[in-house]
């Protein structure tokens, strides 16, 4: 039994890091393998992660972390019984994938303005709370070409757009994702999408 693709890990910079790897053949990850991880810190202890299958030869493990700070470094040991298959390390702050925003809501009752709001996925005491920026994706269910991205580079989790920038009388969907420039993170997953019917009064034309 050998590791074909070494583990790569990403952290949500809060409580979970996810590591994925591939074996050289079909593997029952949960029964055959264990990933041991330990914070390099005074009086820390090793923890065991039981991996799950992720495709035939792929494995994934969700590492639970007490909290995360920028200096953190973890040792990782992948075991098959008594055999050490791979040894490595992981610095969560260098491999951050933020949590997805939640509670995306479209407020349509604000005088021909659409107000989209969502929740920051981090608590106020987490470093990322004040460092997230967002991308909002809006698309038409009827017209695949009607697809747009709005970059929200301020901290407030909201976006205002004129209803008239979208077509009237049809349904739209929106979703939002986040990233943090400070840690050069990847984008989060998209939030669940929300749907609304776009309608607004056409401006009265004077002749």
């Amino acid at each position: 039994m050998k590791v074909l693709q070494e583990p790569t890990c990403v952290s949500d910079y809060m409580s979970i890091s996810t590591c994925e790897w591939k074996m050289n053949g079909p593997t029952n990850c949960s029964t055959e393998l264990r990933l041991l991880y330990q914070l390099v810190f005074l009086l820390s202890e090793a923890h065991t992660c039981i991996p799950e299958n992720n495709g035939g030869a792929g494995c994934v493990c969700h590492l639970l972390m007490d909290d995360v700070v920028s200096a953190d470094n973890y040792t990782l040991d992948l075991w098959a019984g008594q055999q050490l298959l791979w040894k490595g390390s992981f610095k969560p702050s260098e491999h951050v994938k933020p949590r997805a925003p939640g509670n995306l809501t479209v407020h349509t009752n604000v005088s021909d303005t659409l107000l989209l709001t969502w929740s920051n996925p981090y608590p106020p005491d987490n470093y990322l709370y004040n460092h997230l920026t967002y991308a909002v994706n809006i698309w038409s269910e009827n017209d695949p070409a009607d697809f747009r991205i709005y970059n929200v580079t301020y901290l407030e989790p909201s976006l205002r757009i004129a209803a008239s920038t979208l077509k009237s009388g049809i349904s739209y969907r929106a979703r939002v994702r986040a990233w943090a420039q400070c840690y050069n993170t990847t984008w989060s997953e998209w939030s669940p999408s929300t749907k609304w019917h776009n309608s607004y009064r056409e401006p009265f034309e004077q002749h």
Partner: antibody, heavy 120, light 108 residues
Framework: EVQLLESGGGLVQPGGSLRLSCAAS????????MHWVRQAPGKGLEYVSG????????YYANSVKGRFTISRDNPKNTLFLQMSSLRAEDTAVYYC?????????????WGQGTTVTVSS | EIVLTQSPGTLSLSPGERATLSCRAS???????LAWYQQKPGQAPRLLIY???RRATGIPDRFSGSGSGTDFTLTISRLEPEDFAVYYC?????????FGQGTKLEIK
Amino acid sequence: EVQLLESGGGLVQPGGSLRLSCAASGFTLSSYAMHWVRQAPGKGLEYVSGISPSSASTYYANSVKGRFTISRDNPKNTLFLQMSSLRAEDTAVYYCVRVKSKYRGGMDVWGQGTTVTVSS
Amino acid sequence: EIVLTQSPGTLSLSPGERATLSCRASQSISTAYLAWYQQKPGQAPRLLIYGTSRRATGIPDRFSGSGSGTDFTLTISRLEPEDFAVYYCQLYGASSVTFGQGTKLEIK
């Protein structure tokens, strides 16, 4: 309420032994690294020793290494410090301390302290 | 072993004034590992700041921490009578724990 209560201090002769205890309440001891910190009369704080949540690892200041032993009884929510070959310079108030998160984050819960006097 | 040096040894100020206490490490340390404590006579120390700048539960916002590398600061923006005490900085690091020698903040 989260509390730590030390006991076992007293007067002991140089070269003697003493065992300090710390009873934890209001939280699960097994979830935290725990420590002993001391303060000699009129002096500053000095770190003494620490122990990991399941006793897998321990750490000692150089000044007590080989003479003091830290241990814990998680089911009884109690921390111990066995002190032997005591010296006059070990005279201090000994505090039992919990860290804010599992291993770190500052020491957020302190006991009221127990006084150890080493004198002939 | 990293040594923490606090200055000044004693700081004499009046209520309402701003207090700035310094802690210098003998070598660079992570901001995650620096904490500040307050101790009043006959009492156990109390955690004020951890992770250089994060206030512990229940600590008033007149207390703030800052710094990086080797130089760290505890600032009390407007001194209240109950703030006069001894303050300690602490390194709680990946391989050791040490305290500074303390700064006594006294009423002028």
